[in-house]
């Protein structure tokens, strides 16, 4: 039994880091493998992560954590019953993949105007509460063509547009995500998509 | 009541050997790191050795490394400081002190925030 | 090693004055914000030491608000707002950031 790709992780920077390899050959990861990982520091101990089967020969393995600062580093060890197959670190700092956004709504009711809002993924105590900025993806369900993206800059979770930048009369989907500068980041999986039927009065054409 | 007692000390000739105990009770004991601290006769405070609550970890000060082995037995909510080849210059009361929570991933410190009342090791011809 | 020094090391205060400790490390004690790993504890006269403040700042349980601890990185200073007599006795600041851990050389308070 052997690593093929060695795992790589990457940290919410919150609870949980998430790491992901590859065997040689189709593997039971939970009964064949454990990841064993500990904090750089004093008196701490080693911690053990059960792995979950992602796909034939791949594993993935979800490591709990306390909360994360910038100084943390791990040492990770794969183990396969009494054989080490491979040794590692992680610093989860330098590897984050931020949370999805969630709660993503579409508010119809402002005048010819569309109020995109969602929920900050993380708590106010968090660093990365205030370092999010996000992209907003809205596309029509009829038209492919008919896709775009809003970069939001500033740190309200929202996003206003006219209502006319869009087609009239058909439906469209938006979903969010998020990345932190700060870190320089990955970007977070996309939000749940939320659907809505965007209509609005036409200006009234004068001749 | 979250209490430590340590046992053990005594008067020992210099090359001897001492087992220092340290009863734990009123809390996880399992789930802490302990540590022992000395203080010779009219003398600051002294760090001797600390251990993780599993027991897969130790520490020691440079001045007993190699004569003194930290231990610590979680079914009787112990721990042990055994003390072999002595000097003089470890005369000392011999403190026993609740470290941190090591069962968390980064392990969670609140200080040494529990103390034994102290046992006298004298070592002496 | 880190080298921790407090001063003065002799301290006489008249009651319902205030006082001060301070504490001084040779390397920064500061793992992350809010990780700040310098200790105070009291340690009267025949008995064990007592923690007073854990993490530079924070008072241990059943301390009396009249202590407080502040700094990080490498200054840390104790402050007691209004002595009273049953604080005599001798203040240790220790680090517990990496073994060793290692204490100031004590500062007796006495009252005056």
């Known amino acids: 039994m052997k690593v093929l790709q060695e795992p790589t992780c990457v940290s919410d920077y919150m609870s949980i880091s998430t790491c992901e390899w590859k065997m040689n050959g189709p593997t039971n990861c939970s009964t064949e493998l454990r990841l064993l990982y500990q904090l750089v520091f004093l008196l701490s101990e080693a911690h053990t992560c059960i792995p979950e089967n992602n796909g034939g020969a791949g594993c993935v393995c979800h490591l709990l954590m306390d909360d994360v600062v910038s100084a943390d580093n791990y040492t990770l060890d794969l183990w396969a019953g009494q054989q080490l197959l491979w040794k590692g670190s992680f610093k989860p700092s330098e590897h984050v993949k931020p949370r999805a956004p969630g709660n993503l709504t579409v508010h119809t009711n402002v005048s010819d105007t569309l109020l995109l809002t969602w929920s900050n993924p993380y708590p106010p105590d968090n660093y990365l509460y205030n370092h999010l900025t996000y992209a907003v993806n809205i596309w029509s369900e009829n038209d492919p063509a008919d896709f775009r993206i809003y970069n939001v800059t500033y740190l309200e979770p929202s996003l206003r547009i006219a209502a006319s930048t869009l087609k009239s009369g058909i439906s469209y989907r938006a979903r969010v995500r998020a990345w932190a500068q700060c870190y320089n980041t990955t970007w977070s999986e996309w939000s749940p998509s939320t659907k809505w039927h965007n209509s609005y009065r036409e200006p009234f054409e004068q001749h | 009541e979250v209490q430590l007692v340590e046992s053990g000390g005594g008067l020992e000739q210099p090359g001897g050997s001492l087992r220092l105990s340290c009863a734990g009770s009123g809390f996880t004991f399992s789930d802490y790191a302990m540590t022992w601290v000395r203080q010779a006769p009219g003398k600051g405070l002294e760090w001797v050795s600390s251990i993780s609550g599993s027991g897969s970890n130790t520490y020691y000060a440079d001045s007993v490394k190699g004569r003194f082995t930290i231990s610590r037995d979680n079914s009787k909510n112990t721990l042990y400081l055994q003390m072999n080849s002595l000097r003089a210059e470890d005369t000392a009361v011999y403190y026993c002190?609740?470290?941190?929570?090591?069962?968390?991933?980064?392990?969670?410190?609140?200080?040494?925030?529990?103390w034994g009342q102290g046992t006298t090791v004298t070592v002496s011809s | 090693d880190i080298v921790m020094t407090q001063s003065p090391l002799s301290l006489p205060v008249t009651p319902g004055e205030p006082a001060s400790i301070s504490c001084r490390s040779s390397?920064?004690?500061?793992?992350?914000?809010?990780?700040?790993?310098l200790d105070w504890y009291l340690q009267k006269s025949g008995q064990s030491p007592q923690l007073l403040i854990y993490?530079?700042?924070n008072r241990a349980s059943g301390v009396p608000d009249r202590f407080s601890g502040s700094g990080s990185g490498t200054d840390f200073t104790l402050k007691i707002s209004r002595v009273e007599a049953e604080d005599v006795g001798f203040y240790y600041c220790m680090q517990a950031l990496q073994t060793p851990y290692t204490f100031g050389q004590g500062t007796k308070l006495e009252i005056k």
């Open positions: 390397q920064s004690l500061d793992y992350s914000i809010g990780y700040n790993y």
């Open positions: 002190a609740k470290d941190r929570l090591t069962i968390a991933i980064r392990p969670y410190y609140y200080g040494l925030d529990v």
């Open positions: 993490l530079a700042s």
